[in-house]
């Protein structure tokens, strides 16, 4: 990316991190920023299976505000699909039309999954929505594969990985896995007392990891999936961020951002300890330690701010 960005900007940091995470296409979606603009991304999503959009490959733009992730992105479809208007910002709870429902923990990946998830739903006259007939949508799905984007040079046939056959889990499972992996449940504190938040470690979460595939029990004609929890493992865990494509295909800025994040990761333990049950006596001690740590962290931030204010002449790219 030739344009110079302020690497201290939360939006720039976050977008570079997301660009690295989404660098490799999946069989269902892909998104990357334009060469010359980190705040405009182009994405490609596969139409959801078992729907009128099955077989379709749809392309669009994501325009991110400077305040991202505090404010939502705007999403514009560029491929005719029969569900969303082409060239118009679409109205979803994860898009710029609904800033009140947007959550900063959501991401571009969340937006892509939402687009896929909402495609088969009824538009109900929402802004930017269409209600074409199933036949029209199927025809557009077929036609969508021939689309080529002038803006980013993507040809739909080559953008996504081929669909896995047979073992490919259902759309609901993929959504569930992404949702579970992506949303930070709780900031964890590692052994050194440093809080690891979602901004530090995208895939850290305090979850019980049950099996990825548990057989569905069918009761008569009702597909009712119910799971007991007795035998689950109790440890919280840290899932490392996804490997990124070789440095050669990254800009120097992206490479530096990646190296910094890797350095940051290498200083934290591999396993984030789950919250162990404690008695009331140790709770007070823990609280006191936490207060001291937070006070020190606050003091460090204040000194850093003063230092940066005085030493602004050294404000160059790392």
């Amino acid at each position: 990316m030739e344009t110079r960005y302020n690497l201290k900007s939360p939006a720039v940091k976050r977008l570079m991190k997301e660009a690295a995470e989404l660098k490799d296409p999946t069989d269902h979606y892909h998104a990357q920023p334009l060469e010359d603009n980190l705040f405009e991304w182009h994405f490609t999503v596969r139409g959801p299976p078992d729907s009128d959009f099955d077989g379709g490959v749809y392309h669009g733009r994501i325009v991110l505000p400077p305040e991202y992730p505090m404010k939502p992105p705007s999403i514009i479809l560029l491929t005719a699909n029969g569900r969303f208007e082409v060239g118009k910002k679409i109205c979803l709870s994860i898009s710029g039309h609904h800033p009140e429902t947007w959550q900063p923990s959501w991401s571009i990946r969340t937006a892509l999954l939402a687009i896929i998830g909402f495609m088969p739903t009824k538009g109900e006259g929402a802004i930017g929505s269409l209600d074409y007939t199933p036949e029209e949508r199927r025809a557009l799905a077929k036609k969508s594969q021939d689309f080529c984007c002038e803006g980013c040079g993507s040809a739909m046939k080559d953008v996504l990985l081929p669909l896995k056959s047979g073992s490919d889990s259902s759309q609901a499972d993929q959504e569930a896995k992404e949702l579970a992996r992506q949303i930070s449940f709780k900031a964890e504190v590692n052994s050194s007392g440093k809080t690891i938040s979602e901004s530090d470690l995208n895939h850290s979460f305090s979850l019980t990891d049950l099996q990825d595939d548990i057989p569905t029990t069918f009761q008569g004609a009702t597909a009712s999936t119910s799971y007991g929890l007795q035998n689950s493992s109790a440890a919280s865990f840290h899932q490392p961020t996804q490997p990124v494509a070789k440095n050669t295909s990254m800009s120097p800025r992206q490479r530096r951002a990646q190296q910094q994040s890797q350095r940051r990761l290498s200083t934290s333990p591999d396993v984030i300890q789950g919250h162990q049950p404690r008695d009331n006596h140790t709770d007070h001690g823990g609280s006191a330690v936490l207060i001291v740590i937070l006070t020190l962290a606050l003091a460090a931030l204040i000194f850093r701010r003063i230092y940066l204010a005085n030493e602004y002449i050294f404000d160059f790219e790392l």
């Epitope: 959801p48 078992d50 729907s51 979803l92 709870s93 994860i94 959501w106 969340t110 999954l113 939402a114 998830g117 909402f118 088969p120 739903t121 009824k122 109900e124 889990s169 259902s170 759309q171 609901a172 499972d173 993929q174 959504e175 569930a176 896995k177 992404e178 949702l179 949303i183 049950l210 990825d212 595939d213 548990i214 057989p215 569905t216 597909a223 999936t225 799971y227």
Partner: nanobody, 111 residues
Framework: QVQLQESGGGLVQPGGSLRLSCAAS????????MAWYRQAPGKERELIAV??????KLAESVKGRFTISRDNAKSTVYLQMNNLKPEDTAVYYC??????WGQGTQVTVSS
């Protein structure tokens, strides 16, 4: 239009049980991940359970006490809550894919 309607909340004593239901409409239910979130007073909304077709994950805080299940024929997702604690007091929200939300149902655990 996507609609999610939670029910089953209420006042319960510590150690008691509740079963929350979420009736969904306006989308292809079986193709969608469903989730339960909760928000305690003065705290951030927290994701506690996610269910796909054959996939489930639960937050550590509810492990061994809560189960999530779905009935595709009824387009309904459930949250069975056992051995409730005062700290489980919150408004519980049902969600489609973490993007559409219900209005929430209040759960209060108190003696």
């Amino acid at each position: 239009q996507v609609q999610l309607q939670e029910s089953g909340g209420g006042l319960v004593q510590p150690g008691g049980s509740l079963r929350l239901s979420c009736a969904a409409s306006g989308f292809v239910f079986e193709n969608s991940a469903m989730a339960w979130y909760r928000q305690a007073p003065g705290k951030e909304r927290e994701l506690i359970a996610v269910i796909g077709t054959t996939f489930i994950k639960l937050a550590e805080s509810v492990k061994g006490r809560f189960t999530i299940s779905r009935d595709n024929a009824k387009s309904t997702v459930y949250l069975q809550m056992n051995n409730l604690k005062p700290e489980d007091t919150a408004v519980y929200y049902c969600s489609k894919s973490g993007a559409y939300w219900g209005q929430g149902t209040q759960v209060t655990v108190s003696s």
